[in-house]
């Protein structure tokens, strides 16, 4: 079954690689196991750059080698990306399924651009 | 290093499939991110898919995202890439490569220092 999630169109990360949004979902039942899993779309390519199951009202638990963090209030999930360089610059797309209890929900959002700058390097100082 | 061998390729009609296989051995096999790549005759090589060193994360290209399935079992030191609907621009050698390093936003660009000798995929029309 199909559900709504709603992500912000973009974001510029800090000039420490750090992107943050929030993706929330209209839960239509009482879920108790969250699955949330963050895709990157761009260079002709979709990646699951991170992804982590919880149990509502859980710390999130990301699989494997992560760069993400992330915490969840309700319905919403503050995601943070660390580490990020502008060779990382994409279309950032939240995916939420509702595991369990049954029946199964996917939503998937309209991702978020997310835009990061180098910083430059400091000057040399004499 | 890792040492890569790949099996599985052969000739098959278009909307056939094929699995290829990739068995390793030498280093610890779960400390290695891997991918498949792929290059036809006269073009350059490409990345196809790629699998995180639990086998939890997976990156495709958009031309076979949908079709084809990359997975791992660590405990058997094998990758495999599920190969559905093939077309004939499929056509190519297919290679497994490993790289010791974590996953991240493009794992297409990651260092892969081990490389099989590849299997040759040809679909016909």
């Known amino acids: 079954k199909a559900m709504h999630v709603a992500q912000p169109a973009v974001v510029l990360a800090s000039s420490r690689g750090i992107a943050s949004f929030v993706c929330e979902y209209a839960s239509p039942g009482k879920a108790t196991e969250v699955r949330v899993t963050v895709l990157r779309q761009a260079d002709s390519q979709v990646t699951e750059v991170c992804a982590a199951t919880y149990m509502m009202g859980n710390e999130l638990t990301f699989l494997d080698d992560s760069i993400c963090t992330g915490t969840s209030s309700g319905n919403q999930v503050n995601l943070t990306i660390q580490g990020l360089r502008a060779m990382d610059t994409g279309l950032y797309i939240c995916k939420v399924e509702l595991m369990y209890p049954p029946p199964y929900y996917l939503g998937i959002g309209n991702g978020t651009q997310i835009y990061v700058i180098d910083p430059e390097p400091c000057p040399d100082s004499d | 290093e890792v040492q890569l061998v790949e099996s599985g390729g052969g000739l098959v009609q278009t909307g056939g499939s094929l699995r290829l296989s990739c068995a390793a051995s030498?280093?610890?096999?779960?400390?290695?991110?891997m991918g498949w790549f792929r290059q036809a005759p006269g073009k350059d090589r490409e990345f196809v898919a790629a699998?995180?060193?639990?086998?939890?994360?997976?990156s495709y290209a958009d031309s076979v995202n949908g079709r084809f399935t990359i997975s791992r079992d660590n405990a058997k030191k094998m990758a495999y890439l599920q190969m559905n609907s093939l077309k004939p621009e499929d056509t190519a050698s297919y290679y497994c490569?490993?790289?010791?390093?974590?996953?991240?936003?493009?794992?297409?660009?990651?260092?892969?220092?081990?490389w099989g000798q590849g299997t040759q995929v040809t679909v016909s029309s």
């Open positions: 699998i995180s060193r639990s086998g939890s994360l997976k």
């Open positions: 490569a490993a790289a010791p390093v974590p996953w991240g936003t493009r794992p297409s660009f990651l260092t892969y220092d081990s």
């Open positions: 030498g280093r610890t096999f779960s400390n290695y991110t």
